[in-house]
């Protein structure tokens, strides 16, 4: 294992995670560890000199940066709150407050919204979409021949009972919010009033 700074033929250092090629001196030099930055660039005779990031700044990775990134607070106006503080080697970790969920744009959580568990009223059901989410439910009426009799975010419309399949007759027709009511057929020979 070569100790930086060292010269190399093909500009590819042995440990690319922790070393980098410095073209000005044609040598491989040490990167600075997380939490530090380059205070003095390496030369042919001296390796990189690193220093700890100043207060309220950080570098997350092995680097050869001349500065540290400024810590950014979590934006409480957008519904975020810090779950872990910014340290010299890690930016602040932000998360939506409990009871709030992320609104995503290009795979990034851009702001938080109150979770609204929409209740679909009797006669309607939640529209099925590809997204498996409890928020922003769109309620649609039951199809003809179907009913749904609860206020629920997940209940599905069910087909009306077909009385004849059970050997019964219809006493009251089904609606979008109630099932068909069936009754026993009249006895043979019974007098119809």
């Amino acid at each position: 294992q070569l100790v930086p700074p060292y010269r190399i033929e093909n500009q590819t250092c042995w440990d690319q995670d922790k070393e980098y090629y410095e073209p000005m001196h044609d040598v491989c030099c040490s990167r600075c560890p997380p939490g530090e930055f380059v205070f003095a660039v390496c030369s042919r005779s001296q390796d990189t000199v690193c220093k700890t990031c100043p207060h309220n700044s950080y570098n997350e990775h092995w680097n050869h940066l001349s500065t540290c990134q400024l810590c950014r607070p979590c934006d409480i106006v957008l519904g975020f709150e810090e779950v872990a503080p910014c340290t010299s080697d890690r930016k602040a970790e932000c998360r939506c407050q409990p009871g709030m969920s992320c609104v995503y744009l290009d795979n990034e959580c851009v702001h938080c919204e109150e979770e609204r568990l929409v209740l679909c009223q009797p006669g309607t059901e939640a529209e099925v979409t590809d997204e498996i989410m409890d928020t922003d439910v769109n309620c649609v009426p039951c199809k003809p021949g179907h009913f749904q009799n609860t206020s629920s975010p997940r209940a599905r419309c069910q087909p009306h009972t077909r009385c004849e399949i059970q050997g019964l007759v219809e006493a009251a027709p089904g609606t979008s919010y109630s099932d068909t009511i069936c009754k026993n057929p009249p006895e043979p020979g019974a007098m119809l009033l």
Epitope: P98, G99, E115
Partner: antibody
Framework: EVQLVESGGGLVQPGGSLRLSCAAS????????MNWVRQAPGKGLEWVSG????????YYTDSVKGRFTISRDNAKNTLDLQMTSLRAEDAAIYIC????????WGQGTMVTVSS | DIQMTQSPSSLSASVGDRVTITCRAS??????LAWFQQKPGKAPKRLIF???SLDSGVPSRFSGSGSGTDFTLTISSLQPEDFATYYC?????????FGGGTKVEMK
């Protein structure tokens, strides 16, 4: 350095009242949900109440709803818990905690409910 | 309310052992879970947040995993200072809830 210092605990009779306070320093108080967590002797941790950063939303565990009131003063960096109609089962160490993920904790103040 | 069920409630182990504690949520909580260590007479100390992120200054022998309803805290090689009680906590929704705790004792 984050510091949370609770005060106001003590001995109170059943049905009595007590006001706990938590003085916070070392962080931007107004940016964090603040919570009270309690621990009865020899028992586990129980979240009691929380208040949103701006103080506009408050949350309580079912057993204290209507009896306890949480409040905060962002100008003074203080968190309070007004406890009324105290019961024997409320006796515990009450600890102030920073953030909804409880990043930092105080040392707690003891509340004893006994006749 | 979201119930957090921790197991085992206690365990005996020796220095150097690999220790695993599990926590199950009664409904999905994404990764909104923290693990805490508490020693007698002391305030709890957070070890892990967001299910798997290690808090600053916490030894790397501690690790967390899981998402949804099932979560695990692992101590890869138990040290003398690790004998304590461990709690999980969900912060997906109010009321915030803790597991019942796992006491790690010396075998």
């Amino acid at each position: 350095e984050v510091q949370l210092v609770e005060s106001g605990g003590g001995l109170v009779q059943p049905g009595g009242s007590l006001r706990l306070s938590c003085a916070a320093s070392g962080f931007t108080f107004s940016s964090y949900t603040m919570n009270w967590v309690r621990q009865a002797p020899g028992k586990g941790l129980e979240w009691v109440s929380g208040v949103a950063p701006s103080g506009d939303r408050t949350y309580y565990t079912d057993s204290v709803k209507g009896r306890f009131t949480i409040s905060r003063d962002n100008a003074k960096n203080t968190l309070d818990l007004q406890m009324t109609s105290l019961r024997a089962e409320d006796a515990a160490i009450y600890i102030c905690a920073q953030g909804f993920a409880f990043t930092n904790w105080g040392q707690g103040t003891m509340v004893t409910v006994s006749s | 309310d979201i119930q957090m069920t921790q197991s085992p409630s206690s365990l005996s182990a020796s220095v150097g052992d690999r220790v695993t504690i599990t926590c199950r949520a009664s409904q999905g909580i994404s990764s909104a879970l923290a693990w805490f260590q508490q020693k007698p007479g002391k305030a709890p100390k957070r070890l892990i947040f967001d299910a798997s992120s290690l808090d600053s200054g916490v030894p790397s022998r501690f690790s967390g995993s899981g998402s949804g309803t099932d979560f695990t805290l692992t101590i890869s090689s138990l040290q003398p200072e690790d004998f304590a009680t461990y709690y999980c906590q969900q912060y997906n929704n109010y009321p915030l809830t803790f597991g019942g705790g796992t006491k790690v004792e010396m075998k």
